[in-house]
């Protein structure tokens, strides 16, 4: 499948688990917290201020990185996964922190968490990985 | 190897506008976000915009919010700052960065920058 | 924002001692610190990555340490190409911020 239709697709079940994640959860627009979003490269659920949440690396590493193997397993499609399962000093896991001011940036960011090969990539169709 | 080479640097007068080009090579331009720095002639380095590898996601220091605009060509290899309503304040040597992701990251590779000068 | 405050502004060593530079966060930034070299008239070099991991053609004399609010960079023992300007970076939380900058000079 190309990436623009893999990354549609991520993103439109991204915001139905967001949306999903928000009924178990009560959460709604006043709510204190961080609002699950998809911030164009993967999914964050909805977490409560001093919660911190793990991802594995997304989909755009596997494009990036296809001979990349990661411990970690992959976040359900179906529901966010159980984030207690990773663990950040596994290679292939993203965290982000819900504070008072709402979300902090990836950590670590997703190159260092995920691995990028930017020797091999020089090679790599420079359009392929567009997500428009 | 990287490099970074920025333009489009010079002497304007306040209120106006100008439009900076960094030119990249020697990486995969487009798999990277991209950062402007700021250096105020003898000062520290101030933080000004970054933007995604794909320019889906773009964000600013307050102090140039509304006024400047961070975008790319991924097909010229080329990131731009496109800068309005210039004050006295902007004059700085604007340095464009490499960050190491895909969506902001730190920056690891520089520019040697353009000097804006903002004058009437 | 988060406000980075370094200190001390400026620091007179000798080419053999060891250099001690803090730097600190209004907010904790976890370990998205890293620290930076800027000679006269040069861009910035990349010096640590996450507060303490080291960068390969980064001489081992340099470590950083330290997580949350409060960072130290040391320099195990000065060379005389180590004089400059180190600035602390945070990239934990929008909009990115850079330290004030700690001069180390010759005493």
């Known amino acids: 499948m190309h990436s623009d239709c893999i990354f549609k697709k991520e993103q439109a079940m991204c915001l139905e688990k967001i949306q999903r994640a928000n009924e178990l959860m009560g959460f709604n627009d006043s709510s204190p917290g961080c609002p699950g979003m998809w911030d164009n490269i993967t999914c964050w659920k909805p977490a409560h201020v001093g919660e911190m949440v793990l991802v594995s690396c997304p989909e755009l590493f596997r494009i990036f990185n296809p001979d990349q193997v990661w411990e970690t397993e992959t976040i359900g499609e179906s529901d966010f996964g159980d984030s207690n399962s990773l663990d950040l000093s596994d290679m292939g896991v993203v965290s982000r922190n819900c504070t008072e001011d709402g979300w902090s940036e990836p950590f670590p960011h997703y190159f260092d968490a995920c691995g990028f090969d930017e020797y091999e990539s020089e090679t790599g169709d420079q359009d392929y990985y567009y997500l428009s | 190897q990287v490099q970074l080479v920025e333009s489009g640097g010079g002497v304007v007068q306040p209120g106006r506008s100008l439009r900076l080009s960094c030119a990249a090579s020697?990486?995969?331009?487009?798999?990277?976000?991209m950062h402007w720095v700021r250096q105020a002639p003898g000062k520290g380095l101030e933080w000004v915009a970054v933007i995604s590898f794909d320019g889906g996601n773009k964000y600013y220091a307050e102090s140039v919010k509304g006024r400047f605009t961070i975008s790319r060509d991924n097909s010229k290899n080329t990131l731009y700052l496109q800068m309005n309503s210039l004050r006295a304040e902007d004059t700085a040597l604007f340095y464009c960065?490499?960050?190491?992701?895909?969506?902001?990251?730190?920056?690891?590779?520089w520019g040697q920058g353009t000097l804006v000068t903002v004058s009437s | 924002e988060i406000v980075l405050t370094q200190s001390p502004a400026t620091l007179s060593l000798s080419p053999g001692e060891r250099a001690t530079l803090s730097c600190r966060a209004s907010k904790s930034v976890g370990r998205s610190l890293h620290w930076y070299q800027q000679k006269p008239g040069q861009a910035p070099r990349l010096l640590i990555k996450?507060?303490?991991q080291s960068l390969s053609g980064i001489p081992a004399r340099f470590s950083g340490s330290g997580s949350g609010t409060d960072f130290t960079l040391t320099i195990s023992s000065l060379e005389p190409e180590d004089f400059a300007v180190y600035y602390c970076h945070q990239s934990s939380r929008l909009p990115f911020t850079f330290g004030p900058g700690t001069k180390v000079d010759i005493k």
């Open positions: 996450y507060a303490s």
């Open positions: 960065a490499r960050g190491y992701d895909v969506l902001t990251g730190y920056p690891d590779y």
């Open positions: 020697g990486f995969t331009f487009s798999r990277f976000a």
